[in-house]
Interface confidence: low
């Protein structure tokens, strides 16, 4: 569950697209090694971020809802959660990531195929705000129609980086993998565990680009070792 | 319970043809893409064809692409599969099946005997 | 793409098999383990080269790095004895591939 996660480290307001696209914890899951695979971060692993307390939609980012973190949690106990991609369970527009709205209880693309000008009225059958999938969906989602001809634009499913455009990388979220960007200089980063451990790999980030590298920022060093922040900088 | 049940197998000579259906319950079907893996006797498992959630993209293996046709019918939980040219190497078990990593589900099978 | 399985793999009740699955550049791709029992169709063992669906017994384990993907069964019984398949989305073909798979044989 969720309250197994929530206790961990670090902050909240990343800049896009990292708040909420690794923002964020999710279920808890079993992850690979945390190990950097060459060109790619399929075993990258996460430190996961404190919990950003909300009372409405409108308080967390773009990519965010606010939302009870447990299935049938207090109302009062909200944070603010990763949106739900395409095809996953919803109960409002705003659980859906930007160019999906909630319909039957299902986020779906708000594109011209799917969209006809009305949004339509958000399904009233209570899910209870749980991270799980409709029907037990599986983690990565199953083949669709973006990810396998043009290379994926920021937000497309992917399997792995070379699914992706120049400058994104494929990084897992919430069950799915999805293109995000390399990180630039300045943003927050994963510093990789040594190989064998484990950790949490519901948001993963990307790896820094080129000529940088993921370093424990000097005016963390005074932090525990649970809370250092680590940043791309320079080599 | 999760149930895909599929039909249509049976005895057919060279070169003609033969539709397979999966009927799929307990799930909603319309959310998950669908495959056809086939398994000739005492051989391995051999994918055959996908097909999208929403029927808009559709791939096939090298040794069926052009004679069959993979379908579905989402207001009726069907998924099937168009056999054209049957070929003595297509005899094989039959199986529907999601493939969809923790929601892997498949059926029991149907037998295809292409002889003649 | 191409992977490649070894044909059988033989081991004594209570110690550990290990089933290969070779494939270029195969840890970049997710793997999924199905096992299949005479006349019954493959059940999914591992998925995502290390996830287990919850109904698997944690005996069965995986893992994926480089040019090989490993199943191991620790703790082997006579009733894991069956064929076992590795599978991955090969996106270059836009095609599912199967392993030609492993017989175990619980000695």
């Known amino acids: 569950t969720l309250n197994s996660v929530l206790n961990s480290n670090a902050i909240k307001n990343l800049p896009p697209p990292l708040g909420g696209a690794a923002g964020h914890p999710g279920s808890a899951v079993s992850a690979a090694p945390g190990i950097l695979y060459p060109g790619g971060n399929k075993y990258q692993t996460i430190d996961n971020y404190q919990p950003y307390p909300c009372a409405e939609d409108e308080e967390c980012g773009t990519d965010e809802y606010c939302a009870s973190p447990t299935r049938g949690g207090d109302a009062g106990v909200q944070i603010c959660l990763a949106c739900r991609k395409r095809r996953k369970r919803c109960m409002r527009h705003a659980m859906c990531c930007p160019g999906n709205y909630c319909k039957n209880g299902i986020c779906v693309s708000s594109d011209q195929n799917h969209f006809r000008g009305e949004i339509e009225e958000t399904i009233t059958e209570s899910f209870g705000n749980d991270h799980s999938t409709l029907d037990g969906y599986s983690r990565r989602t199953t083949l669709s129609s973006k990810m396998y001809h043009t290379k994926g634009q920021e937000g497309s499913v992917c399997l792995r980086s070379s699914d992706c455009a120049s400058g994104l990388c494929c990084a897992r979220h919430f069950w799915s993998k999805i293109c995000k960007p390399v990180l630039k200089e300045g943003q927050v980063c994963t510093k990789h565990r040594r190989k064998g451990s484990h950790g949490l790999e519901i948001f993963q980030r990307c790896y820094c680009g080129e000529g940088l590298s993921c370093r424990i920022q000097k005016d963390h060093h005074q932090a525990s070792n649970s809370s250092r922040l680590h940043t791309c900088q320079r080599h | 319970q999760v149930q895909l049940v599929e039909s249509g197998g049976g005895v057919v000579q060279p070169g003609r043809s033969l539709r397979l259906s999966c009927a799929a319950s307990?799930?909603?079907?319309?959310?998950?893409?669908m495959h056809w893996v086939r398994q000739a006797p005492g051989k391995g498992l051999e994918w055959v064809a996908i097909?999208?959630?929403?029927?808009?993209?559709?791939y096939y293996a090298d040794p069926v692409k052009g004679r069959f046709t993979i379908s579905r019918d989402n207001s009726k939980n069907t998924l099937y599969l168009q056999m054209n040219s049957l070929r003595a190497e297509d005899t094989a078990v039959y199986y529907c099946?999601?493939?969809?990593?923790?929601?892997?589900?498949w059926g029991q099978g149907t037998l295809v005997t292409v002889s003649s | 793409y191409v992977l490649t399985q070894p044909p059988s793999v033989s081991v004594a009740p209570g110690q550990t098999a290990r089933i290969t699955c070779g494939g270029n550049n195969i840890g970049s791709k997710s793997v999924h383990w199905y096992q299949q029992k005479p006349g019954q169709a493959p059940v999914l063992v591992v998925y995502?080269?290390?996830d287990r669906p919850s109904e698997i017994p944690e005996r069965f384990s995986g893992s994926n790095s480089g040019n090989t993907a490993t199943l191991t069964i620790s703790r082997v019984e006579a009733g894991d004895e069956a064929d076992y398949y590795c599978q991955v989305w090969d996106s270059s073909s836009d095609h599912v591939v199967f392993g030609g798979g492993t017989r175990l044989t619980v000695l």
């Open positions: 307990g799930f909603t079907f319309s959310r998950y893409d």
């Open positions: 097909i999208f959630y929403d029927g808009s993209n559709k």
């Open positions: 099946a999601t493939l969809a990593a923790a929601f892997d589900y």
């Open positions: 995502d080269d290390s």
